[in-house]
Amino acid sequence: LPAQVAFTPYAPEPGSTCRLREYYDQTAQMCCSKCSPGQHAKVFCTKTSDTVCDSCEDSTYTQLWNWVPECLSCGSRCSSDQVETQACTREQNRICTCRPGWYCALSKQEGCRLCAPLRKCRPGFGVARPGTETSDVVCKPCAPGTFSNTTSSTDICRPHQICNVVAIPGNASMDAVCTSTSPTRSMAPGAVHLPQPVSTRSQHTQPTPEPSTAPSTSFLLPMGPSPPAEGSTGD
């Protein structure tokens, strides 16, 4: 005959652990049910009665199976230099990422805490390394034979046009000016446009809650008895 399935709460066998979606309650000394994502423990289990779970209130969430007494607060609304790539729901925190033309100067576990505008290379300088979600543009002076006449976070140094007869020689910030006859464009090595930085930001697929000590008040929430209930294993 198969072994009888134990219903929560139950005392685990010595040396064994509680099953998936259960936790060991130190006070009751029983294996008890965890609460599903979007819920939290409203009443803890006893030796004879199981955990009572309740839905997270507005603007709060739990992402994992848990036994936290309070849901976590969603982060504050995204600032004007950000876009909300994931809304606050009962099961997930809001994620804010930087809008196009900005990069994340101070990241957090998910999304960005502080965005900054991408550096624009002034005339005479071109983009050496393009901006990414988390790094700024790096500019470099245009080498002899190349120029950039724009203030841009995407334009690289381009080769001067080659004239049959030069009217005005090119410099780092200006193309050469030819007289009358059609110029030919030099194809100097590396003279390709760098791709535009990605404007739609990807989001992490496996988010984890920030520790309760993070400076953001959105995560400074009671985690209940140790070991931490949100973010525990056995999800």
Epitope: A41, K42, F44, P69, M223
Partner: antibody
Framework: QVQLQQSGPELVKPGASVTISCKAS????????IHWVKQRPGQGLEWIGW????????KYHEKFKGKAILTADTSSTTAYMQLNSLTSEDSAVYFC???????????WGQGTTLTVSS | DIQMTQTTSSLSASLGDRVTISCRAS??????LNWFQQKPDGTIKLLIY???RLHSGVPSRFSGSGSGTDYSLTISNLEQEDMATYFC?????????FGGGTKLEIK
């Protein structure tokens, strides 16, 4: 045996501030909420707010925001409630109580009587 | 805020009696109701939580029941030490609120 030992009675003048303490013993102080409850003479009980000493998060009844400030010192396992700009309406017995989940208070302090009078 | 009403402010009963104290909420509190006992010296103890769960160390003569907005505390075999004031408290919605109390006296 879980104990919450509160500080003694206070007689203070209107406009002053007072701090009441609640010393916790025989349990893990950082794993439980400490609540504060007000009881006016001959009246019911009013929940003021809670503090979670594990990360010093607080939650207040809207009515007591600005009136009460809750703090906790984990090294001495003591919770404190400071009451500001006292008036005769603040004369009451104040209780601390602990809870594991936020809503039910399983052990209570003995109460601290506050009298506000000139 | 949710209002908690204990219509009987005081009642007297004899030792050995079965006593029921009632409490009504201004809206459905989904069984998130507790009962406390306050002795004449001011000390407060949790008796029942989540409508019917007996707190550890509380005698089994205390029991709780109810649902929705109506709840009750029953003391099945009244003893002298039960002379106290009994408060209900909801924890469905912040702020947590208490009833006005029912003072139980022994005849």
């Amino acid at each position: 045996q879980v104990q919450l030992q509160q500080s003694g009675p206070e007689l203070v003048k209107p406009g002053a501030s007072v701090t009441i303490s609640c010393k916790a013993s025989d349990y893990s102080f950082t794993n439980y909420y400490i609540h504060w409850v007000k009881q006016r003479p001959g009246q019911g009980l009013e929940w003021i707010g809670w503090i979670y000493p594990g990360n010093v998060i607080t939650k207040y009844h809207e009515k007591f925001k600005g009136k009460a400030i809750l703090t906790a010192d984990t090294s001495s396992t003591t919770a404190y409630m400071q009451l500001n700009s006292l008036t005769s309406e603040d004369s009451a017995v104040y209780f601390c109580a602990r809870s594991r989940a936020t809503g039910y208070f399983d052990y209570w302090g003995q109460g601290t009587t506050l009298t506000v009078s000139s | 805020d949710i209002q908690m009403t204990q219509t009987t402010s005081s009642l007297s009963a004899s030792l050995g009696d079965r006593v029921t104290i009632s409490c009504r909420a201004s809206q459905d509190i989904r069984n998130y109701l507790n009962w406390f006992q306050q002795k004449p010296d001011g000390t407060i103890k949790l008796l029942i939580y989540y409508t019917s769960r007996l707190h550890s160390g509380v005698p089994s003569r205390f029991s709780g029941s109810g649902s929705g907005t109506d709840y009750s505390l029953t003391i099945s075999n009244l003893e002298q030490e039960d002379m106290a004031t009994y408060f209900c408290q909801q924890f469905n919605t912040l702020p947590w609120t208490f009833g006005g109390g029912t003072k139980l006296e022994i005849k």
